[in-house]
């Protein structure tokens, strides 16, 4: 995690960047032209409920999954997302070990589930903020 506490404005800037990156990474993975993504509603939030860091991404929960899928993506964007998530990781809890499924179909589902969840979560929050401010 980071050595110093990030300011709220810095956190927001990283979140906005992650929102754009996650969408691009998803498009890259699907070899997709820019278009409307199916929105997976009703998924667990990717944001922390920690009163110490309100509005911050729940990095400690997301990082292990991104670290697990990153080698399969072979994409600089995923490495950069991991770097940014690391900056937002204020919890010093031991990291959960996440392993990739060995079955090809299950691996594809696993990767796409993580990418869509993260991208949709950030997108949903951005829309929510846009409507409320």
């Amino acid at each position: 995690g980071p050595i110093y506490q990030l300011q709220p404005k810095e956190i927001q800037a990283i979140i906005v960047e992650l929102q754009n990156l996650s969408k691009k990474l998803l498009d890259d993975y699907l070899n997709k032209e820019k278009g409307v993504q199916k929105f997976d509603s009703d998924l667990p939030s990717c944001f922390t409920s920690d009163s110490q860091a309100p509005g911050n991404i729940n990095s400690s929960a997301i990082l292990p999954y991104f670290k697990a899928i990153s080698p399969s993506l072979n994409n600089d964007k995923s490495l950069y997302i991991i770097e940014q998530l690391d900056k937002l990781n204020f919890q010093n809890a031991p990291e959960t070990e996440v392993s990739m499924p060995t079955d090809n179909f299950e691996r594809k589902r696993f990767i796409l589930t993580i990418l869509r969840w993260f991208s949709n979560c950030l997108e949903h929050r951005a829309q929510h903020h846009h409507h409320h401010h």
Epitope: N31, K38, D40, D42, L43, P44, F110, T113, I114
Partner: antibody, heavy 118, light 113 residues
């Protein structure tokens, strides 16, 4: 909008083979798997198998592995299912259906009615 | 293979009545990564192809009327139609998408009295 176009009907002789087509439009063909299902008259649905158009990875229901062969043509966004050594038991409606692997099968073709008769 | 069991096989109800049908799987369909059950419900009207109603056991597909509700988790699932309309005459199938082969239930035929 998403469309999966299938020929309405095929009539073939017993012992012959047939190649059923499913032309996809309205979405990125390689971003979704394609499923095939069989439905005999008045019966339920049977899952035949699925193919990933991006790399042609295939998974079959073991019941159909010697009967069906799934392929795709990316250039025309078309999925195919070849059925071999046809008998009257193969007479059925065959559906192609788009598979979103995160959620479910979300769009179905209209189905091709296959009649195997001499 | 995962076995999907649906009940009843058929039922006849009057317009406006509430209907529930059951689907049971031989193993849990809960996907731990997103805590979603890979269970879908399809409606097949006479002479038509199936149409997606519900996915993830309880998420209504866009455009599906609110009278259709899916519930359940693990191995036991239910489709409820809160107030049946004449256009609901159809066969309803559940399908597991947890692992291939993606098996279907045998269907529940809904008839209107």
């Amino acid at each position: 909008q998403v469309q999966l176009q299938q020929p309405g009907a095929e009539l073939v002789r017993p012992g012959a083979s047939v190649k059923l087509s499913c032309k996809a439009s309205g979405y990125t063909f390689t971003s979704y798997w394609m499923n095939w299902a069989k439905q005999r008259p008045g019966q339920g649905l049977e899952w035949i198998g699925m193919i990933d158009p991006s790399d042609s990875e295939i998974h079959y229901n073991q019941v159909f592995k010697d009967k069906a062969t799934l392929t795709v043509d990316k250039s025309s966004s078309t999925a195919y299912m070849q059925l071999s050594s046809l008998t009257s038991e193969d007479s059925a409606v065959y559906y192609c259906a788009r598979q979103d692997i995160v959620t479910t099968v979300d769009y179905w073709g209209q189905g091709t009615t296959l009649t195997v008769s001499s | 293979d995962i076995v999907m069991s649906q009940s009843p096989s058929s039922l006849a109800v009057s317009v406006g009545e509430k209907v529930t049908m059951s689907c049971k799987s031989s193993q849990s369909l809960l996907y731990s990564i997103n805590q979603k059950n890979h269970l879908a419900w399809f409606q097949q009207k006479p002479g038509q192809s199936p149409k997606l109603l519900i996915y993830w056991a309880s998420t209504r597909e866009s455009g599906v009327p609110a009278r259709f509700t899916g519930s359940g988790s693990g191995t036991d699932f239910t489709l409820t139609i809160s107030s049946v309309k004449t256009e609901d005459l159809a066969v309803y199938y559940c399908q597991q998408g947890y692992t291939y082969p993606f098996t279907f239930g045998s269907g529940t035929k809904l008839e209107i009295k």
